[in-house]
């Protein structure tokens, strides 16, 4: 039969510039001598010869004189190859081919890696920064391999995904320099972190920059928003109220107004230097231009969706700046529940029935209550499931298993906790007349 050749299943990971051992072994029979051995290492794809041993002699490296065998270990079946000063170009599959009487071969993968340098951060512009200014933060990390994954986040660790451009360029050695550019509208102040990850080494290199915009000696702008969340029905329009107190002589040319998502800092809508810069949020937002000069910075959000739910920051900068966050709570009423009964015929006292109460397209998740005809809660043996559709609206299905009495009414109440809206349905079951003894 064929000779069994063993190599590691997982790729061998080697750092650029270091030496790597590509393990390969076979089981020599008793009385085996090296004179019988033919060993060939070659590149799996191109069949290019890398190193060989034949007729009892090491035939040497055919691969830039950077390979070696372990001659003292060959007789014990160790056919491993030492690859020196690993380069990016070495990455790939190497086949270890062993022939004695029979022959066998196996391929081992070499995965080359190089750690990325600690990122350097540049900020443009880097002086006279004000809230509302757009800045470009560049994160550069050098001489890594393979291509990096780059992540941006704010000081709270929230990912920043919008307006990121990342480019990676390989040098002559095949190592990558990565440059990632984040464009961001400045808030009151902020920390921006860049993390460069080597996916093979699972090595993270990170740096951050903290930007504190210029403050005016005349003091901050006071921004007012409602304390309670704004509740908006799905599909309707919502107004996120925000106001400031303009000073005498205030003109809109002096105003920087930015609405952004509080967590991700994603721009929603802006007004700068006398002009409405428009919606950056699916064209569903609008300001109240005729009211801005009076200090009304409110935002109109049209055709509200479940995905809009969350906190929005209203950021006002005139001489100085101020900001406040308003929460949007999205809601959708639940439909009147439909009730199904199984089984639904030939029912007798003592039978177990399943009553299903279904209500559709509500938000947020519902609270479901069951009760009997006297209003007594039924808590035992209730299973409720809620599934969100593509729009994020919930369909609720609640199942009650109950043993029938002589007759009974069973009510299901579906409550929307935000709207405090109750939708209910009920079913009345009248069992067949009982005969004694009950029929078998």
């Amino acid at each position: 039969g064929a000779l069994e050749v063993q190599v590691p299943e997982d790729p061998v990971v080697a750092l650029v510039g270091t030496d790597a051992t590509l393990c390969c072994s076979f089981s020599p029979e008793p009385g085996f001598s090296l004179a019988q051995l033919n060993l060939i290492w070659q590149l799996t794809d191109t069949k290019q010869l890398v190193h060989s041993f034949a007729e009892g002699q090491d035939q040497g490296s055919a691969y830039a004189n950077r390979t070696a065998l372990f001659p003292d270990l060959l007789a014990q079946g160790n056919a491993s190859l030492r690859l020196q000063r690993v380069r990016v170009a070495d990455e790939g599959s190497f086949t270890c081919f062993v022939s004695i009487r029979d022959f066998g071969s196996a391929a081992v993968s070499l995965q080359v890696a190089a750690p990325y340098s600690k990122p350097s951060m540049t900020l443009e512009p880097n002086k006279d920064l004000r809230p509302g200014d757009t800045v470009t933060i560049t994160c550069s990390s050098y001489q890594g391999y393979p291509e990096a994954e780059v992540f941006w986040q704010d000081g709270q660790g929230v990912p920043l995904t919008g307006n990121v451009t990342t480019s990676q360029m390989a040098n002559e050695q095949g190592l990558f320099d990565v440059h990632s550019i984040l464009r961001v509208v400045l808030g009151a102040n902020g920390t921006y972190s860049c993390l460069v990850r080597n996916p093979v080494l699972q090595q993270d290199a990170h740096s951050s920059v903290t930007i504190t915009p210029q403050r005016s000696p005349t003091g901050a702008v006071e921004v007012q928003v409602p304390e309670d969340p704004v509740v908006a029905l799905v599909g309707t329009d919502a107004t996120l109220r925000c106001s400031f107190s303009p000073e005498p002589g205030f003109s809109l040319a002096q105003l920087n107004l930015i609405w952004q998502l509080t967590d991700t800092k994603q721009l929603v809508h802006s007004f700068t230097e006398g002009r409405d810069q428009g919606s950056a949020y699916a064209n569903r937002t609008a300001l109240f231009p005729d009211l801005l000069a009076q200090g009304n910075a409110s935002l109109r959000l049209q055709r509200v969706r479940v995905a809009d739910e969350g906190s929005f920051t209203c950021f006002v900068s005139i001489r100085d700046f101020g900001s406040a966050a308003v929460s949007l709570q999205v809601a959708a009423p639940y439909s009147k529940p439909s009730m199904t009964l199984e089984p639904n015929k030939d029912l007798r006292p003592g039978d177990t029935v399943t009553i299903t109460c279904s209500s559709y397209r509500g938000y947020p998740e519902a609270e479901v209550f069951w009760q009997d005809g006297q209003g007594v809660p039924l808590t035992g043996n209730v299973t409720t499931s809620q599934m969100a559709n593509e729009q994020g609206l919930f369909d609720v299905h609640s199942v009650l298993r109950v043993v029938l009495g002589a007759n009974g009414t069973y009510s299901c109440l579906v409550r929307n906790p935000v709207l405090q809206q109750d939708a209910h349905g009920s079913v009345t079951i009248t069992g067949q007349p009982m005969t004694f003894p009950p029929e078998a």
Epitope: D128, T138, I181, G249, S251, A253, E273, R319
Partner: antibody, heavy 116, light 107 residues
Framework: EVQLVQSGAEVKKPGSSVKVSCKAS????????MNWVRQAPGQGLEWIGR????????RYNQNFRDRVTLTVDKSSSTAYMELSSLRSEDTAVYYC?????????WGQGTTVTVSS | DIQMTQSPSSLSASVGDRVTITCRTS??????LAWYQQKPGKSPKLLIY???TLEEGVPSRFRGSGSGTHFTLTISSLQPEDFATYFC?????????FGGGTKVEIK
């Protein structure tokens, strides 16, 4: 090193147009607004307008709005200022300058002479 | 537009003199004022921004002050290389507007 290099001097006839270029290097071109400022002989400085290279948003001085067009070519990091319907009082040195509130780097200036 | 009034329009001084240039604005611009120096045949050079922040590389003999509508540029001890024209510029509103300039000449 940040540099703004402008195109050479121009002599134009009244009623014609002139297009001045400003090639930027040494910084991220899309990170800074590019302003255009002119200076008539022996006079002060007059702001014409500015453009944001990232998305080509422009702001103009109303005095020039009908006659000036600001554009950029991001691939070559070059900003352009075109002034039409030239008259003799447009004779001036035209500068590009980067920044939004502070103009920290200026081009060397392009002399535009309008003469019949 | 915000009007910028610079005074004097010119002055003569000697090396070592203390020189003060004034800039007034037609409305409150808070502290958003910059000062530029221009030598004959050259581009303007930024000296001071935000009324009192010295640009990198500018000698400390230049000092800006003021806020609101009244601003001054002071050169504590005039040097030969300081003979030039100085402009103020407001960055509070669009259009940006410049003062008429002050020419500092050798006495």
């Amino acid at each position: 090193e940040v540099q703004l290099v402008q195109s050479g001097a121009e002599v134009k006839k009244p009623g014609s147009s002139v297009k001045v270029s400003c090639k930027a290097s040494g910084y991220t071109f899309t990170a800074y607004w590019m302003n255009w400022v002119r200076q008539a002989p022996g006079q002060g400085l007059e702001w014409i307008g500015r453009i944001e290279p990232y998305d080509s948003e422009t702001r103009y001085n109303q005095n020039f709005r009908d006659r000036v067009t600001l554009t950029v070519d991001k691939s070559s990091s070059t900003a352009y200022m075109e002034l039409s319907s030239l008259r003799s009082e447009d004779t001036a040195v035209y500068y590009c300058a980067r920044g939004v509130r502070i103009f920290d780097y200026w081009g060397q200036g392009t002399t535009v002479t309008v003469s019949s | 537009d915000i009007q910028m009034t610079q005074s004097p329009s010119s002055l003569s001084a000697s090396v070592g003199d203390r020189v003060t240039i004034t800039c007034r604005t037609s409305e409150n611009i808070d502290y958003t004022l910059a000062w530029y120096q221009q030598k004959p045949g050259k581009s303007p050079k930024l000296l001071i921004y935000n009324a009192n922040t010295l640009e990198e590389g500018v000698p400390s003999r230049f000092r800006g002050s003021g806020s609101g509508t009244h601003f001054t540029l002071t050169i504590s001890s005039l040097q030969p290389e300081d003979f030039a024209t100085y402009f103020c510029k407001q960055a509070y509103d669009v259009p940006r507007t410049f003062g008429g300039g002050t020419k500092v000449e050798i006495k």
